[in-house]
């Protein structure tokens, strides 16, 4: 039975050329996290594997940085980065949990950032 829940940064906005941290947090379960995948629509951005560490997809290696924690930092944002992002937690024995974040990259210098939280 899957009892866990994913908390995310929700809907966020950022300024073109800036950077943003995408974060998810899995709670209410004792399941072991074996891997976290970060995806944009159907495109893999990064993997954080418990044994192998971080992998950043070759096409994003210049603009994506691992962390903080299991989160992901997107840099040098462009308007094309606007869209849905997914954190996919692979756990044992629960299975897979998925969180969704919507990022809007604004041309304006007035970009309102959504609420954030710190993972202890």
């Amino acid at each position: 039975m899957m009892t866990g829940t994913i908390e995310t940064t929700g809907n966020i906005s950022a300024e073109k050329g800036g950077s943003i941290i995408l974060q998810c947090h899995l709670s209410s379960t004792t399941a072991q996290v074996t891997q976290v995948n970060w995806e944009q629509q159907d495109q893999l951005l990064a993997i954080c594997n418990a044994d192998l560490g971080w992998h950043i997809s070759p096409s994003f290696k210049d603009r994506v940085a691992p962390g903080p924690g299991l989160g992901l930092t997107l840099q040098s944002l462009t308007v094309n980065d606007t869209g849905e992002y997914f954190c996919i937690y692979h756990t044992y024995p629960d299975g897979t949990y998925t969180g969704r974040i919507f990022l809007e990259v604004l041309e304006s210098s007035v970009a309102e950032h959504g609420a954030r939280f710190q993972i202890p």
Epitope: D51, L52, G53, H55
Partner: nanobody, 116 residues
Framework: EVQLVESGGGLVQPGGSLRLSCAAS????????MGWFRQAPGKERELVAA????????VYADSVKGRFTISADNSKNTAYLQMNSLKPEDTAVYYC?????????WGQGTLVTVSS
């Protein structure tokens, strides 16, 4: 400079199998994991599978899970990718990398074409 040579590609019918090899002039690992990647025409290069240098852990792209198997033989400085139940969408040039996250050296790749 480390040389990587991929081989084993070819033309295969859907449902068929191939075994790719990656031979390195030095250690097949430069980090804690090595990987196989592929690049289809008009698409970005993407991770297919990775294996830790202890061979105790593996990672697979969702699209190949249950069909592909990665392995490595440290004594031969060679890595392998066993590909079963091939699909037309597996058609691509396949590359290996000594570190699944630091793309310092690429081989010339080996072309896999899945077509009837």
């Amino acid at each position: 400079e480390v040389q990587l040579v991929e081989s084993g590609g070819g033309l295969v019918q859907p449902g068929g199998s191939l075994r790719l090899s990656c031979a390195a002039s030095g250690s097949i690992f430069s980090g804690n994991a090595m990987g196989w990647f592929r690049q289809a025409p008009g698409k970005e290069r993407e991770l297919v599978a990775a294996i830790s240098n202890s061979a105790s852990s593996t990672v697979y792209a969702d699209s190949v899970k249950g069909r592909f198997t990665i392995s490595a033989d440290n004594s031969k400085n060679t890595a392998y990718l066993q590909m079963n139940s091939l699909k037309p969408e597996d058609t691509a040039v396949y590359y290996c990398a000594r570190d699944w996250n630091l793309f310092d050296y690429w081989g010339q790749g080996t072309l896999v074409t899945v077509s009837s």
